[in-house]
Interface confidence: low
Amino acid sequence: WELTILHTNDVHSRLEQTSEDSSKCVNASRCMGGVARLFTKVQQIRRAEPNVLLLDAGDQYQGTIWFTVYKGAEVAHFMNALRYDAMALGNHEFDNGVEGLIEPLLKEAKFPILSANIKAKGPLASQISGLYLPYKVLPVGDEVVGIVGYTSKETPFLSNPGTNLVFEDEITALQPEVDKLKTLNVNKIIALGHSGFEMDKLIAQKVRGVDVVVGGHSNTFLYTGNPPSKEVPAGKYPFIVTSDDGRKVPVVQAYAFGKYLGYLKIEFDERGNVISSHGNPILLNSSIPEDPSIKADINKWRIKLDNYSTQELGKTIVYLDGSSQSCRFRECNMGNLICDAMINNNLRHTDEMFWNHVSMCILNGGGIRSPIDERNNGTITWENLAAVLPFGGTFDLVQLKGSTLKKAFEHSVHRYGQSTGEFLQVGGIHVVYDLSRKPGDRVVKLDVLCTKCRVPSYDPLKMDEVYKVILPNFLANGGDGFQMIKDELLRHDSGDQDINVVSTYISKMKVIYPAVEGRIKHHHHHH
C-alpha cells in the first residue's frame, strides 16, 4: 500500500508568492511559493495519485503583514481552502497568546490541529479541550493512518503560551500516544511536529512505532540529487534514521516559507512496516501557475493590507542584508540599521554632562527575518519592515552591569556556526571574538560608546559599571537563552513597537545607506 505525504512547515505568513529569498515578490516572473501556486501543485498530485495526505508541521503564524493584520484568520481560511488534512502546532502559533490561537485558528480550522506534548491546566483546560488533539486517525483510501503531533518544548522561551500550558518532553509524551494508536490497530503512524531536525531524528530513533517523521522549526532543507534553487541540502531526502529497534525511519522537512512542497512516497507492507520511501521537495517556482480561484481570494483579502501598508516610508540605496546567512554569523547592515534606529528613537538630551542617556544597542540576529532589496526603486514600506520584524515586539530600555553584557556576548557565540538566533547585532559597541577559544571565553575585546562625553568615543567595557542598553523585549525577557539579561537586569522600561521605531527612523532619514563597518570582528588565533 502506497501513501503520498505532501508537507509544508514554517510557512510564516507567506500566503502570497515571494522572491527567491522569501522576501516580498518584486519580479512576478521569478517569484515562488504562495498558497495559490501550492494549491495548483497539490491538486495536480491529488488527481494523479490515490492516497494523498497534505500535512503542515507548524509555524504558519508570524512573518508578514498578513499575520499583522489578520492575526491567524488568514491561516485558517486558506488552509481550509487547500484542504489540509492535519497541522501540528508550532511555537509561533502562540505569538498572540493562547486566545490568539483559539479564536482565529483552532475554532475555525476544518482539519485537526495536533500536539501530544502540550498539556493544558487550570481554567484553560476546559476552554481549550478538544480544540487541539494529541493524535488523529485519518482514513486514507481503504486504510487508516495515525498522525501524532508534537511541539518544541522550548516554546515558553520562544513565544507567549502563558502559564496554563505545560510543554513536556517530546519523546516522553509521544510514546504513550503511539502505543495507544497501536492498541487501536493503527499500524501506520506519522509523527508530525515542530521541534527541529535534531529532535525529529531523535523521535525517529527513540519513539517505538513511529514509521515516518515530518518536521519543522529548523527550516531544514533536504534533497536527493542536484538542488533546484539556492538552498544547500543538510542531507538526503528522506533522511533515514535507524531506530533503536532496528527500523529504517524516513525523516523529512521542507525548508520554509512555502517555497517548496515536500513530496514523500511511502510503501507499507500489510503489517504497516515501511518497505520503501523516496521523494524530494518540489520547488514551487513560476513554472507552476497560481490557481485562479485561490489567487482571486488572495487579492480580495489583500485589499485590507494594501490600505494598511503600502505607503513609502523612505528609500534605501543599498541592499539591506537581513539574511540569516549573514545576521546569524557576522555583522549585517540590516542589524546596523535597526540598532541605529533604536538609539535614534531614544535620543533624550537632558543633561549637559551626557550627549545622550544611552548609546548602546543589542539585537538578536534571529529576530531579523528578511532582507530588503533596493532594486524595487529603493522603496521601503511598512510591509517590507513587517517581514523583517514580524514579531510585533518592542524595543526596550534596560540597565545592566558590564559583567552581564560580557556574559551576553559570550552567549552570542557559545555555539557559533549553527545558524542559531542568539548571535548579536550591535550599535554603539565594538566586539571582537576569537572563535578558536572555548565557549564562554570567546570575547577578546568589548568596547562601548561613552555617553558622559561631548565627543562620543569607544572605551573598554567595565565589569562593575551600570550601562543603559536598548534591546528587543524578547531579549529583556531572556529569549534565545539570554537568561543572564532577564536575571541580572537592574531596570527595564518598555519601549515603542519595533516596526514603528524603524519606520519612523527611515521616514526621518528619507534616504538610508547602512554599511558593514567593523562593529563585530572575528579574530582567528591559531594554536
Epitope: 518544548k153 556574559k407 557559545h414 564562554g440 536575571d487
Partner: antibody, heavy 117, light 107 residues
Framework: QVQLQESGPGLVKPSETLSLTCTVS?????????WNWIRQPPGKGLEWIGY???????NYNPSLKNRVTISRDTSKNQFSLKLSSVTAADTAVYYC??????????WGQGTLVTVSS | DIQMTQSPSSLSASVGDRVTITCRAS??????LAWYQQKPGKAPKLLIY???NLGEGVPSRFSGSGSGTDFTLTISSLQPEDFATYYC?????????FGGGTKVEIK
C-alpha cells in the same frame, strides 16, 4: 574561578537511596550551562547520569532514568543527585561537572560511594 | 544511544614517541567530540573540544582530528606527565557517552 565540590555519605546500603550534593562556587547555576552527574565504577570507564539545566529542566540517561532524580537549591548554589534502589553495581566515584551540550570543562574532585551492607 | 568505541584499550610507549588514539562513533556526531585525560585518583581533564580545538592550558603536542564518525587524538611527542588514561566523549545528543578509555603506559 569555577569550582565544584561533591559531598555526601561514602557508604550506602543496598536497596537504599544514594544522595549526593554538588556545591558550585564562582558561577551561578542559574546563569547558564548544564549541571551534570557522571560516575566511574572502580577500574572502569565514565558514565553520564544526567543533568539539570540553568532553567531547571532535567535530562537523564535512559539506563538509569527510573531511579535517578537531579534537583537544585539555587539559594545555596547547589545541585543534588538521588539514586534509588542501589545495588553493588552502583559503587563508583561520582563526579559533578559543568557542560552537557558543551564539553565537560569543570569537574568536581569526585567522591567514592560504596554500596554494601 | 550513540556508542563510542576507542582503540586501543591500552598501549605502551616511550617518552618522545608519537602516540595516536582513535575513537569511532556508531552514528554521525559531526564535530561534537571531546577528549579527556585522567590520572589515577583525579577527575578527568578536558584536552580537546569540537574534535580539534585545544582546551585552555593544554600543551600544543596534543591535537585532535576527524568529524562524522572517526576521530583521532595525537600526542606528537609523549612526555612523562602524559602517562594516563584518555577518554573520548560525544556531546551531540543525550545520552552523552564516553569511549571505554585508552591507558597509555610506560614501555
Amino acid at each position: 574561578q569555577v569550582q565544584l565540590q561533591e559531598s555526601g555519605p561514602g557508604l550506602v546500603k543496598p536497596s537504599e537511596t544514594l544522595s549526593l550534593t554538588c556545591t558550585v562556587s564562582g558561577y551561578s547555576i542559574t546563569s547558564r550551562y548544564y549541571w551534570n552527574w557522571i560516575r566511574q565504577p572502580p577500574g572502569k570507564g565514565l558514565e553520564w547520569i544526567g543533568y539539570i539545566t540553568y532553567d531547571d529542566n532535567n535530562n537523564y540517561n535512559p539506563s538509569l532514568k527510573n531511579r535517578v532524580t537531579i534537583s537544585r537549591d539555587t539559594s545555596k548554589n547547589q545541585f543534588s543527585l538521588k539514586l534509588s534502589s542501589v545495588t553493588a553495581a552502583d559503587t563508583a566515584v561520582y563526579y559533578c561537572a559543568r557542560g552537557g551540550w558543551d564539553p565537560f570543562l569543570y569537574w568536581g574532585q569526585g567522591t567514592l560511594v560504596t554500596v554494601s551492607s | 544511544d550513540i556508542q563510542m568505541t576507542q582503540s586501543p584499550s591500552s598501549l605502551s610507549a616511550s617518552v618522545g614517541d608519537r602516540v595516536t588514539i582513535t575513537c569511532r562513533a556508531s552514528d554521525n556526531i559531526y564535530s561534537y567530540l571531546a577528549w579527556y585525560q585522567q590520572k589515577p585518583g583525579k577527575a578527568p581533564k578536558l584536552l580537546i573540544y569540537s574534535a580539534k580545538n585545544l582546551g585552555e592550558g593544554v600543551p600544543s603536542r596534543f591535537s585532535g582530528s576527524g568529524s562524522g564518525t572517526d576521530f583521532t587524538l595525537t600526542i606528537s611527542s609523549l612526555q612523562p606527565e602524559d602517562f594516563a588514561t584518555y577518554y573520548c566523549q560525544h556531546y551531540y545528543g543525550t545520552p552523552f557517552t564516553f569511549g571505554g578509555g585508552t591507558k597509555v603506559e610506560i614501555k
